[in-house]
């Protein structure tokens, strides 16, 4: 099934969204810290 329809599952999508959310939070935090330090 490496080239089948089951390669794009909702559980996989949710994990990707969670990672994106986490990265956005971390990068946002870093950006705010940089601005603060200036």
């Amino acid at each position: 099934h490496s080239d089948g329809i089951f390669t794009d599952s909702y559980s996989r999508y949710r994990k990707q969204m969670a990672v994106k959310k986490y990265l956005a939070a971390v990068l946002g935090k870093r950006y705010k810290q940089r601005v603060k330090n200036k």
Partner: antibody
């Protein structure tokens, strides 16, 4: 992340028609996309899927009657080769493999002489 | 293609009541790829449950999916007026095809 269908209109039987699905917030290079239709007052009917590589899968009744293809990283098409009045329906595109977690609002196709 | 038989085609219950919808497949679904959808008139379907028993994001815990293999059930408890809709099951199969059930109209009295 969202999807939207376009291209639905009134056509006469036998006139080919192409519907387009435009996605935003993700790329078709990493998604499985589907076409699902619903005749007025009827249930949902899966037409087929296109996976990230471009490989397509169809319901047996749809094979030869419909062609799904990717036209860019954000658009895919459904070609109705020779529509009949039985193809009158709202056509939805939806993301997901075997389960459909992002749906468009649908586009109405009316086939009538 | 596999056939997904959904029963009943219509059911009704009072606010606060319980509704049970069944889906039977003519062959086993692939790796529990059975999902449930809610559809209201003029709207696209709304994704409720995936892989037979998992709630999609934002779906109330009043919705419960169960089953495996060829037999699946959607149970809605503590019915609300807003639950009035048509519900569909869909199964994914190892042949890389998908089949929908015929739908169940839920009327809330």
């Amino acid at each position: 992340q969202s999807v939207e269908e376009s291209g639905g209109r009134l056509v006469t039987p036998g006139t080919p028609l192409t519907l387009t699905c435009t996605v935003s917030g993700f790329s078709l290079s990493s998604a499985v996309m589907n076409w699902v239709r619903q005749a007025p007052g009827k249930g949902l009917e899966w037409i087929g899927s296109i996976v990230a590589s471009g490989t397509t899968y169809y319901a047996s009744w749809a094979n030869g009657r419909f062609t799904i293809s990717k036209t860019s990283s954000t658009t895919m098409d459904l070609k109705m080769t020779s529509p009949t009045t039985e193809d009158t329906a709202t056509y939805f595109c939806a993301r997901g493999g075997g389960e459909f977690f992002i749906w468009g609002p649908g586009t109405l196709v009316t086939v009538s002489s | 293609d596999p056939v997904m038989t959904q029963t009943p085609s219509s059911t009704s219950a009072a606010v606060g009541g319980t509704v049970t919808i069944s889906c039977q497949s003519s062959e086993s679904v692939y790796s529990n790829y059975l999902s449930w959808y809610q559809q209201k008139p003029g709207q696209p379907p709304n994704f409720l449950i995936y892989q037979a028993s998992n709630l999609a994001s934002g779906v109330p815990s009043r919705f419960k999916g169960s089953g495996s293999g060829t037999q699946f059930t959607l149970t809605i408890t503590d019915l609300e007026c807003d639950d009035a809709a048509t519900y569909y099951c869909a199964g994914g199969y190892s042949e890389n095809i998908v089949g929908f059930g015929g739908g169940t109209e839920v009327v809330v009295k």
